[in-house]
């Protein structure tokens, strides 16, 4: 069984200072661990590069909205 207690935690210590076009973005994940010093979003680009971004920035929030909408399936 994997040892969840010792599972590695990914943190972001610096954020990109450039706005990334949504056309270059494939997905995102949130860093929610209390072990990390900052709230953060990690975007994965279409070429599989991971980029740390500041969730307080409007372009980051808009990009997350855009990516969320792409997952929408009319199930309900």
């Amino acid at each position: 069984q994997p040892d969840a207690i010792n599972a590695p935690v990914t943190c972001c210590y610096n954020f990109t200072n450039r706005k990334i076009s949504v056309q270059r973005l494939a997905s995102y994940r949130r860093i929610t661990s209390s072990k990390c010093p900052k709230e953060a979003v990690i975007f994965k680009t279409i070429v599989a590069k991971e980029i740390c971004a500041d969730p307080k920035q409007k372009w980051v929030q808009d990009s997350m909205d855009h990516l969320d909408k792409q997952t929408q399936t009319p199930k309900t």
Epitope: R29, R30, D62, D68, K69, T71
Partner: nanobody, 123 residues
Amino acid sequence: EMQLVESGGGLVQAGGSLRLSCAASGRTFSSYRMGWFRQAPEKEREFVALINRSGGSQFYSNSVKGRFTISRDNAKNTVYLQMNSLKPEDTAVYYCAAGAQMGWAEASTYDYWGQGTQVTVSS
């Protein structure tokens, strides 16, 4: 951690209205997709409504579409659910949730949950 506290539930007659509120603290509220879910006795938790971060896009389950309205005030860190034309089948505990992970209406993409507020609709 993000804390979510719901309020506004209660007992109402069929055809009546209620407005639920969910106050958030501890994280950057405007960076989360917000949703409402509900769970009736002996039933599974079900999606009710969601609103995106900007507030410009809302999505509803077919069972509440046209009767319920979700909105948010990012300045007040609060999301609302206006419930009109309530029916006995709307009786449930209503939960507010913050969507941290990429997704839409799937409960698994919501990382933070409130304790819930009871809504009872009598006939």
